[in-house]
């Protein structure tokens, strides 16, 4: 058993039928010695008396809010949560496996630049009685500070018969140098509590590997005289690290016809303009990627050819 | 990106072209190592990230763009001094910091060159003959060093009398390649920045 936060405790259980469970001793936080009784949740049934209560925790029915009273007055509470170990592996019932970029990806994180600021998100089908707490650090043995905000519900989607809820959190490394070469990964730890079930999820990454620039901005077309060609121009996104001559991007320019089946013409360039043939009803799209370290491409910025 | 790329002419700054070749070569070598050594811990998640130049050179600090010198977190200054002449500085007014930066890059390349050559000698003794260093990568390191053209004491190639542990050597190769790729990215950024200045 260990303390998650004040008056909230996590009991780790090897989850199998007829398991002996864990013996837990609760102590009432009071100077009183006599006349103390214990109850669980909203029940008025007295579970025991005295300053301590010894219980055998085997299943969810044994978890919950234990309260010690004296003469009708509440003295203190202890909330017991369960963390299930299923055949040697901690349960992952609360969050959905996003399966991207690989199986067992419960937390996904992205950064728009090298400032040390990043966003992580996760998915669940659970809509109520759900709380998250996020901690982060650079490295684990001698951790350096990363500050995370509160996790918030950022999107709701309908997936088949189920509703899916997306939660996200923003974190910022306390003293980040955009030009630094990372040798210790960022560690992100999410504590998830659903009713009386506790689970924890972790992700470890280098900022350089989770970079995804915003799409190029100010995408414009300039027709060239007496030609089907147009000059496409764009700018670096505002959120990208500066100076741009140091943090350079490379770009992919795509001409896409109205039909998805039509052949796509693609050009790659390090410049912020390109000359392409604009077909009728086609659209021109541009996306960006770090020029020197191939992490993710940005989403496309698009304009119609007409 | 194995697709056609319209790259700008390196123009006045001869080192930019070499640094781009260097990054391409080390990235290819790392990819080859990850594929060939698939049963070894060779991915970014699995290896220990070590920097053989730590406390010996200060490339990141010495080559910091002016715009980032206001960032306190970037000014983790380390006392270092380097010889300051080099042909990449040709026909350019350069500050002491720029010379320091380029000589730091030269020292990095020299240290990696020695490590890679020592390692290759060991890998050539492996009866499995599983992996060797790409001669192109070693040649590109050499070309960039020549372009930088700093006078520097030659570092003798390390020789080892004991029987090499090929498993450890291959893991060390992965560690070195990951670190060198990160340094090659920094070098490319620096050359691009200097070229634009």
């Amino acid at each position: 058993i260990w303390e998650l936060k004040k008056d909230v405790y996590v009991v780790e259980l090897d989850w199998y039928p007829d398991a002996p469970g864990e013996m837990v001793v609760l102590t009432c936080d009071t100077p009183e010695e006599d006349g103390i009784t214990w109850t669980l949740d909203q029940s008025s049934e007295v579970l025991g008396s005295g300053k301590t209560l010894t219980i055998q925790v085997k299943e969810f029915g044994d978890a919950g809010q234990y309260t010690c009273h004296k003469g009708g007055e509440v003295l203190s509470h202890s909330l017991l949560l369960l963390h299930k170990k299923e055949d040697g592996i901690w349960s992952t019932d609360i969050l959905k496996d996003q399966k991207e970029p690989k199986n067992k990806t419960f937390l996904r994180c992205e950064a728009k630049n090298y400032s040390g600021r990043f966003t992580c998100w996760w998915l669940t089908t659970i809509s109520t009685d759900l709380t998250f707490s996020v901690k982060s650090s650079r490295g684990s043995s001698d951790p350096q500070g990363v500050t995370c905000g509160a996790a918030t519900l950022s999107a709701e989607r309908v997936r088949g018969d189920n509703k899916e809820y997306e939660y996200s959190v923003e974190c910022q490394e306390d003293s980040a140098c955009p030009a630094a070469e990372e040798s210790l990964p960022i560690e992100v730890m999410v504590d998830a509590v659903h009713k009386l079930k506790y689970e924890n999820y972790t992700s470890s990454f280098f900022i350089r590997d989770i970079i995804k620039p915003d799409p190029p901005k100010n995408l414009q077309l300039k027709p060239l005289k007496n030609s089907r060609q147009v000059e496409v121009s764009w700018e670096y996104p505002d959120t990208w690290s500066t100076p741009h001559s140091y943090f350079s991007l490379t770009f992919c320019v795509q001409v896409q016809g109205k039909s998805k089946r039509e052949k796509k013409d693609r050009v790659f360039t390090d410049k912020t303009s390109a000359t392409v043939i604009c077909r009728k009803n086609a659209s021109i799209s541009v996306r960006a990627q770090d020029r020197y370290y191939s992490s993710s491409w940005s989403e496309w910025a698009s304009v119609p050819c007409s | 990106r194995n697709l056609p790329v319209a790259t700008p002419d390196p123009g006045m700054f001869p080192c930019l072209h070499h640094s781009q070749n260097l990054l391409r070569a080390v990235s290819n070598m790392l990819q080859k190592a990850r594929q060939t050594l698939e049963f070894y811990p060779c991915t970014s998640e699995e290896i220990d990230h070590e920097d053989i130049t730590k406390d010996k050179t200060s490339t990141v600090e010495a080559c910091l763009p002016l715009e980032l010198t206001k960032n306190e977190s970037c000014l983790n200054s380390r006392e270092t001094s380097f010889i300051t002449n080099g042909s990449c500085l040709a026909s350019r007014k350069t500050s002491f910091m720029m010379a320091l930066c380029l000589s730091s890059i030269y020292e990095d390349l020299k240290m990696y060159q020695v490590e890679f050559k020592t390692m290759n000698a060991k890998l050539l003794m492996d009866p499995k003959r599983q992996i060797f260093l790409d001669q192109n990568m070693l040649a590109v390191i050499d070309e960039l060093m020549q372009a930088l053209n700093f006078n520097s004491e030659t570092v003798p190639q390390k020789s080892s009398l004991e029987e090499p542990d090929f498993y450890k050597t291959k893991i060390k190769l992965c560690i070195l390649l990951h670190a060198f790729r990160i340094r090659a990215v920094t070098i490319d950024r620096v050359m691009s920045y200097l070229n634009a200045s």
Partner: antibody
């Protein structure tokens, strides 16, 4: 006393279907994930499918994906394996088993796919 | 095909010590715990070892398990006639969990 009893096996022609059941007793069935494992005659053990305690997630071996469906009815304390488009290579003893460290297995039910 | 490799057979005289190896990789045995099962002819597998080296109650202490890196082993000391059976190791892969990974199986023969 934890008990798992499989049923529904038999002889079936290739391309036909069969539904196996696994009746659980002596424990809180709805609290545990469950597996189906099979063993072809004279061969080793092969994992077939898994279902979460609440039925929310299902996983399958590549060899049965798209043909077999695992399901459970927690009100009946029963695990099921719906087997469609059966092939000769599906011939095996099928076991159900709890997803726990101290696991419990059923006695198995024989499925023979033969023309 | 199984990704956990076991020797097809091992044998020993009564009273002897035999060991069965189970070889995997970093993503399975290297990252997860190992179980061992005994299967007598015509019966369901019986759990011998869980969490690499733990014996459920009722399993004789002649059976012991261990794990090191990407491989595990089962040792049977004081071999007895009733130990003649098939033995399987089992683990998970960190990327395909909860799919069960079984070893190829080892036939233990007790020499007369």
């Amino acid at each position: 006393q934890v008990q798992l009893v499989e049923s529904g096996g038999g002889v079936v022609q290739p391309g036909r279907s069969l539904r196996l059941s696994c009746a659980a007793s002596g424990f809180t069935f709805s609290s545990y994930g469950m597996h189906w494992v099979r063993q072809a005659p004279g061969k080793g053990l092969e994992w077939v499918a898994f279902i979460r305690y609440d039925g929310s997630n299902k996983y399958y071996a590549d060899s049965v994906k798209g043909r077999f469906t695992i399901s459970r009815d927690n009100s009946k304390n029963t695990l099921y394996l719906q087997m469609n488009s059966l092939r000769a290579e599906d011939t095996a003893v099928y076991y159900c088993k709890t997803h726990t460290s101290h696991d419990n297995w059923g006695q198995g039910t024989m499925v023979t796919v033969s023309s | 095909q199984s990704v956990l490799t076991q020797p097809p057979s091992v044998s020993g005289a009564p009273g002897q010590r035999v060991t069965i190896s189970c070889s995997g990789s970093r993503s399975n045995i290297g990252s997860n715990t190992v179980k061992w099962y005994q299967q007598l002819p015509g019966t369901a597998p019986k759990l011998l070892i869980y969490y690499n080296d733990q014996r459920p109650s009722g399993v004789p202490d002649r059976f012991s398990g261990s794990k090191s890196g990407t491989s595990a082993s089962l040792a049977i000391t004081g071999l007895q006639a009733e130990d003649e059976a098939d033995y399987y190791c089992q683990s998970y892969d960190r990327y395909t969990h909860p799919a069960l990974l079984f070893g190829t199986g080892t036939k233990v023969t007790v020499l007369a």
